[in-house]
């Protein structure tokens, strides 16, 4: 469940048999690209001794063994040193391919693969590149959300990648929206979330060599039916001096489509309250918006009259949410004793 | 503090049922993987069940598929065991564990409750 | 039969070190983290060891995990008498289905 897509750069392959002497045969004008272990940092490699520079045709780079065209005069030992504590993390001895007749049995050369692009690798099983990233294997998502599951691998030859849903392979013909497969990030998406998509995910990740899987446990949270909740703090006390414009704004979450009214409570006959204990209140704006959306009521050019008490009341299906504030508004000539006053000054809604 | 405390266990024949339950208290069940684990006398951990925190999704050990139905209440912060068709090596100890949300693994349990099947 | 193998017992005795090995596949302990259970006698089961070498707050120093390709192990440095107990591994396991597996467990004793 990430928010991005990284860019991730081409994976390299790593010599298979860690710490032990491995041979490769590489044939003239090939490119090399070889990688010490599964980590970038922290690792030199090394030919005959001298540690390579990290730019030019023989180079090494980001744990990484880079020769752009194979050369004769690249044949020869390489190490991978682990900076440090300079541990021998590879071993390498690479051939001209027309050298392999100088190579004796018992040192079993390993097979080498090209890919369409020349660069040649030893064969590899599928292997996870960063298994870090598979640790939530959990996952409880709101109904309604994007969930992106991860299995980033690599292999030689490239391994595939299929999922499944309980078991069954899964190409999303059947969900709503369907899925995303993004096999260059090696990526399952599946967009608006709803109860039938709990279940268990599995990737698979085969080559000719071997494979790998991966689970993870999706469960999606339905949405429990609520009145709508009003953000704390909204509208706010303000401070207006007479002839300003103000805002008051209302804040409102409701999966339900909301109902919005401002309320202005006024007196009647000396009172504020009517006999059945409401509020006597004028309705000022009715409006409808979508979900999370912020509700503004503007009061233009305000006097005296304006000062009093506003309601936000919000309503939907389920029931009703209100949230009260209060206006002040000073005459213009006690400006200079507003904006003095901390308190009152963070309040002030100037709008000319 | 984080608590889970079993109950229902007890003496059942084969064939019969039991409900077992699971009182979870300090802290918010309601978003939390839960599990059933079970230890038969003398014996090492066996997995049974997970449930999601929805309640919704719901996964079993093979040994225990068809017959056992995990199930959760979250206005009652409880989680269940329904176990039906009991056999003589469902006797166990069984526990209650909730899950770590971001590793996936048990990060408390419960005292646990005995359940023997017996003729 | 566990799907995770451990041996059966350990022993050492006091302020020696003792390792306890878990064995599994590419399905379990392979593609998923390591979880360590300590059960001391007549208790339940306590979190050990979490993500292959993760403590949780509590768990003394002296205990450590590690993780290399398809086993695990436990290493208890400095024993003590009340480390007597059941250990046991754990992982989740992605075969046909996805399920939790635990090893069989186990018995150290202290000796002394």
């Known amino acids: 469940l990430e928010a991005s897509e990284e860019m991730e750069q081409e994976p390299c392959l790593a010599p298979i048999l860690e710490q032990q002497e491995q041979v490769l045969t590489v044939a003239l004008g090939q490119p090399v690209r070889l990688c010490c272990g599964r980590t970038e940092r922290g690792r030199h490699w090394y030919k005959e001794g001298s540690r390579l520079a990290s730019a030019g045709r023989v180079r090494g780079w980001r744990g990484r063994l880079e020769i752009a065209s194979f050369l004769p005069e690249d044949a020869g030992r390489y190490l991978c040193l682990a900076r440090g504590s300079m541990t021998v993390v590879h071993n390498l001895t690479l051939l001209m391919d027309d050298s392999l007749t100088s190579i004796s049995n018992d040192e079993d050369p390993k097979t080498l693969s090209s890919s369409s692009s020349g660069h040649v690798y030893p064969q590899q099983a599928p292997y996870w590149t960063h298994p870090q990233r598979m640790e939530k294997k959990l996952h409880a998502v709101p109904a309604g959300n994007t969930v992106k599951f991860r299995c980033p691998a690599a292999g030689n030859p490239m391994p595939t990648i299929h999922w499944l849903k309980d078991g069954q392979a899964f190409h999303g013909e059947n969900r709503i929206g369907g899925i995303r497969l993004r096999h260059q990030h090696w990526s399952l998406v599946m967009e608006s979330v709803v109860p039938s998509d709990r279940g268990t995910y599995t990737c698979l990740v085969e080559n000719s060599l071997g494979s790998i899987r991966y689970s993870y446990l999706l469960d999606v949270l339905e949405r429990s039916p609520h009145r709508p909740i009003l953000q704390a703090g909204l509208p706010a006390n303000t401070t207006a001096v007479v002839g300003s414009d103000v805002e008051l704004l209302c804040k409102v979450y409701s999966d339900a489509q909301p109902h919005i009214q401002w309320l202005k409570h006024v007196v009647i006959n000396g009172s504020s309250f009517g006999a059945d204990g409401f509020p006597y209140v004028q309705v000022l704006k009715t409006t409808d918006i979508n979900s999370s959306e912020v509700e503004v009521l503007y009061l233009r050019n305000v006097s005296a009259e304006d000062a009093g008490e506003y309601t936000c009341l919000a309503g939907n299906s389920i029931g009703l949410s209100y949230q009260s504030a209060w206006l002040t508004v000073l005459p213009e000539e006690d400006l200079t004793w507003t904006t003095a006053t901390p308190e009152a000054a963070s309040h002030h809604h100037h709008h000319h | 503090e984080v608590q889970l405390l079993e109950s229902g266990g007890g003496l059942v024949q084969p064939g019969g049922s039991l409900r077992l339950s699971c009182a979870a208290s300090?802290?918010?069940?309601?978003?939390?993987?839960m599990a059933w684990v079970r230890q038969a006398p003398g014996k090492g951990l066996e997995w049974v069940s997970v449930?999601?925190?929805?309640?919704?999704?719901?996964v079993y050990a093979d040994s225990v598929k068809g017959r056992f139905t995990i199930s959760r209440d979250n206005s009652k912060n409880t989680l269940y065991l329904q176990m039906n068709s009991l056999r003589a090596e469902d006797t166990a100890v069984y526990y209650c564990?909730?899950?770590?949300?971001?590793?996936?693994?048990?990060?408390?349990w419960g005292q646990g409750t005995l359940v023997t099947v017996s003729s | 039969q566990s799907v995770l193998t451990q041996p059966p017992s350990a022993s050492g005795t006091p302020g020696q070190g003792v390792t306890i090995s878990c064995s599994g596949s590419?399905?379990?302990?392979?593609?998923?983290?390591v979880n360590w259970y300590q059960q001391l006698p007549g208790a339940a089961p306590k979190l050990l060891i979490y993500?292959?070498?993760l403590r949780p707050s509590g768990v003394p120093a002296r205990f450590s995990g590690s993780k290399s390709g398809t086993s695990a192990s436990l290493a208890i440095s400095g024993l003590r008498s009340e480390d007597e107990a059941d250990y046991y591994c754990?992982?989740?396991?992605?075969?046909?289905?996805?399920?939790?597996?635990f090893g069989g467990g186990t018995k150290l004793t202290v000796l002394g």
């Open positions: 564990a909730r899950i770590n949300s971001g590793s996936s693994h048990f990060d408390y």
């Open positions: 300090g802290f918010t069940f309601s978003t939390y993987w």
């Open positions: 449930i999601g925190p929805s309640g919704g999704m719901t």
């Open positions: 590419s399905s379990n302990i392979g593609s998923n983290s």
């Open positions: 993500s292959n070498n």
């Open positions: 754990a992982a989740w396991d992605d075969g046909l289905d996805a399920y939790v597996v």
